[in-house]
């Protein structure tokens, strides 16, 4: 059976989160997708969404969030760049399917952003270095105002996933140290 899980990413200010959410290609390829934050005791809040209908491999940038929907492959890529401590929280990808409730995708992301110097990646056996620049031309999409009422905010155990930032470029490191915890079955 499919389990709803959380994956915890511990990053430093100025670093980036680079994740993907998969969806059923046949059902949702051109549907509008969104990236939401779920804060304790609050309704999920939509931060960014793809266009409607969603365009294939067309980056959409809303502030520091970049969404790219590879709907030939059933994958939504989400990048949050130049992370701030206040970005910490529980995130999820959803698919808008009005008039029905948004459809939540697996997995949820527990992001913990801490202050501190993000220098050169260390010698951790899992460390990686993905440097990329924010796409120069992107489109801001209008997102529906409604949010999903489903909230689950169980905190998983600690894990490590460091990232570092030289100047304006973003390095992603230690993404393999992410912890997965079941939220419910």
């Amino acid at each position: 059976a499919t389990k709803l899980t959380e994956e915890k990413y511990e990053l430093k200010e100025g670093q980036t989160l680079d994740v993907k959410c998969d969806y059923t290609l046949e059902k949702f390829a051109s549907s509008q997708k969104a990236w939401q934050i779920i804060r304790d005791g609050e309704m999920p809040k939509t931060l960014a969404c793809t266009e409607r209908p969603s365009k294939n491999s067309h980056p959409v940038q809303v502030g520091r969030i970049i969404l790219e929907d590879y709907h030939d492959h059933g994958l939504l890529r989400v990048r949050m760049v130049n992370l701030q401590v206040e970005d910490s929280g529980l995130y999820q990808c959803v698919i808008y399917q009005p008039p029905k409730e948004p459809h939540m995708l697996f997995d949820r992301i527990r992001l913990v952003v801490t202050k501190g110097f993000s220098g050169t990646p260390g010698s951790n056996e899992n460390s990686t270095q993905n440097v990329y620049k924010i796409p120069p031309t992107t489109t801001k999409a209008l997102c529906p105002l409604y949010t999903s009422p489903r909230t689950v905010t169980q905190a998983p155990p600690k894990s490590t996933a460091d990232v570092s930032t030289p100047d304006s470029e973003i390095n992603l490191t230690n993404v393999t140290d992410i912890i997965r915890v079941p939220v419910f079955n």
Partner: antibody, heavy 123, light 107 residues
């Protein structure tokens, strides 16, 4: 340690289908995507697509989209790749591969490979 | 789709030589590039990920560099066991594609 053990070699006639299995051990099967890569004899590597064993969702390159089906049985930690309407140019070694990072990480580094399954298509 | 062009397609070198293989992407792929080694009759093995990071257990004579469109894979001192075909692979976007391979042999 992580192991991916694939099913044995197959000989098929043109137009037939083949289903290759990939049994995973040494890690939590539902935590990492399984990808499929093929290699025709003496040729280079060709990515076919991916599957998330937790959600069951999958995606494949346009070239294979109408002919390939990727499934899994989580109870026995096994992934399957079925290729239909076989033609002679599908003769290749098919590899299942596990990525370096968890399913949610955008990180397509092929860290753990099965031993490969030779599929021969011949009339 | 992004095309990955490796050069040379084959090369012959002596034990102890410094060997360099290049990989060129058809457009900027930042550092989303991996290198693999494949010995005859075996599955490929990940050597370098994200352009320059050495996979655990891989000898330090192997290294990678570059970003954007031009990448280099280097063996600082060729050993007999390094005889293999080497492939680059990008993942800047989907679909993922590989270079055509570089076959390395001992003189």
């Amino acid at each position: 340690q992580v192991q991916l053990v694939q099913s044995g070699a197959e000989v098929k006639k043109p137009g037939a289908s083949v289903k290759v299995s990939c049994k995973a051990s040494g890690y939590t099967f539902t935590s990492y995507d399984i990808n499929w890569v093929r290699q025709a004899t003496g040729q280079g590597l060709e990515w076919m697509g991916w599957m998330n064993p937790n959600s069951g969702n999958s995606g494949s390159v346009k070239k294979f989209r109408d002919r390939v089906t990727m499934t899994r049985d989580t109870s026995i930690s096994t992934a399957y790749m079925e290729l239909s309407s076989l033609r002679s140019e599908d003769t290749a070694v098919y590899y299942c591969v596990r990525l370096i990072g968890y399913s949610s990480a955008y990180k397509w580094s092929f860290q753990h490979w099965g031993q490969g399954t030779l599929v021969t298509v011949s009339s | 789709d992004i095309q990955m062009t490796q050069s040379p397609s084959s090369l012959s070198a002596s034990v102890g030589d410094r060997v360099t293989i290049t990989c060129q992407a058809s457009r900027d792929i930042s550092k989303y590039l991996n290198w693999y080694q494949q010995k005859p009759g075996k599955a490929p093995k990940l050597l370098i990920y994200d352009a320059s990071n050495l996979e655990t257990g891989v000898p330090s004579r192997f290294s990678g560099s570059g970003s954007g469109t031009d990448f280099t894979f280097t063996i600082s001192s060729l050993q007999p066991e390094d005889i293999a075909t080497y492939y680059c692979q990008h993942y800047d976007n989907i679909p993922i594609t590989f270079g055509q391979g570089t076959r390395l042999e001992i003189k």
